[in-house]
């Protein structure tokens, strides 16, 4: 007997983080033998949706014309071939932004940082939240969580970064969220650039900025400076 059918690939276009009201397309790609595709959403009656394959039958499209809270969540897909159902795909987490008012992102002691020094990014929300996320643009793994230890609501989260180097130049935004659904995020904060000056790699003041604690290529996730919780919040990796 042949082994289990290979699991399909699941992804979203234009991406998995979608603003409220925008359209998103979920794709499930299996094999040419696929006869039907099924999309399941966690905590929803299964299947969440079924679609016939598009020619040449190796993938199916699931369309969301206007993103709302109801669509945010964790998805998996399967396909059916003549020999049965496939393994489930790796999960896709579809996140909606715009659920809450935007927080403010600022820098202590200053937004212009000398290379090798330290900086703390502060994400502050008007109303108490229990999760804060720091986003670095154009990073492959952009999310750094600070989540409340005991469901305690916080107005802010601190992201200490040290040492700052020009290698991690970029623009940062933050989001806030409630624990009951980490798939629902606030509007993004206004962007904050952390300008790194006087770096060893480039003696000229540079308009690029960085705020990371680990040296490494651009697409590495931000690294926290330590595991000590700040403001009752705990670090999580995406």
């Amino acid at each position: 007997q042949a082994g289990p059918l290979p699991k399909p690939t699941l992804w979203a276009e234009p991406g998995s983080v979608i603003s409220w009201g925008n359209s998103v397309t979920i794709w499930c790609q299996g094999t040419l033998e696929a006869r039907e595709y099924r999309l399941d959403k966690e905590e929803s009656p299964a299947p969440w949706d079924r679609q016939n394959p598009l020619e040449p039958k190796n993938k199916a499209r699931f369309s969301i014309p206007s993103m709302t809270e109801d669509y945010a969540g964790r998805y998996r897909c399967y396909y059916r071939s003549p020999v049965g159902w496939s393994q489930p795909s790796d999960p896709l987490e579809l996140v909606m932004t715009g659920a809450y008012s935007k927080p403010t992102l600022s820098a202590l002691p200053s937004p212009l940082v000398t290379s090798g020094k330290s900086v703390t990014l502060l994400c502050q929300s008007r109303s108490p939240m229990d999760t804060f996320l720091l986003i670095k643009e154009r990073a492959a793994h952009p999310l750094l969580h600070l989540r409340s230890e005991h469901g305690a609501q916080q107005h802010q989260a601190e992201f200490p970064m040290s040492p700052v180097t020009s290698v991690h130049g970029g623009t940062y935004r933050c989001f806030s969220s409630h624990g009951f659904s980490h798939y629902l995020l606030s509007h993004p904060s206004d962007p904050l650039e952390l300008i790194v000056s006087g770096s060893l790699e480039d003696p000229r003041p540079s308009p690029t900025r960085s705020v990371s604690t680990a040296a490494g290529p651009e697409d590495q996730p931000l690294m926290p400076t330590g595991s000590v919780p700040h403001s009752g919040l705990r670090r999580h990796w995406e």
């Epitope: 020094k117 802010q156 403001s231």
Partner: antibody
Amino acid sequence: EVQLLESGGGLVQPGGSLRLSCAASGFTFSSYAMSWVRQAPGKGLEWVSVISGSGGSTYYADSVKGRFTISRDNSKNTLDLQMNSLRAEDTAVYYCAKLGDYYYGMDVWGQGTTVTVSS
Amino acid sequence: DIVMTQSPLSLPVTPGEPASISCRSSQSLLHSNGYNYLDWYLQKPGQSPQLLIYLGSNRASGVPDRFSGSGSGTDFTLKISRVEAEDVGVYYCMQALQAPWTFGQGTKLEIK
């Protein structure tokens, strides 16, 4: 009413130590970064140090780095400045100040406490 | 470090007349977010400093509207539309764009 009240100043010999305290009231202390600023006799203002709301991040002027330590106790609403290896040029009035929302501006200041370093 | 230079260092003013203080920084304080990281403080005789203006042009809470801040980049101005006797003291500008935060030398405003 938002208030900051410094204490701990006094006369100390060069090389000695002193610990300044600042008692805060009238606001959610843990939500705000706090700073120390000093003013030498007849001179202008000089920033000394700042600490984030949680106390997890601290920053210093080069002139005091390695000698001064800023800390806070959010359960007691107090800000401290431990000053070691004091020099004559550390003689000043030391003010504690609360930073405003989003770290913009020092919007509340204490009355100051005088530190004199002299033999 | 960013150097802050104020002028004039002494400013005698007649009550009811306008007053203007200039502050220049050794490098631009305009950040990419559109904010100028410059504050103005007033230290009245025998008192602690108080915040007047933050981010270049935003009046702090409780500050009379006769005080205004303007400028961008490296050149900033604090204006008092009509000076009152209670405005006497030393005015300081301070940059917060880059640590260490640095103050200007101060401008002493006195009544003629």
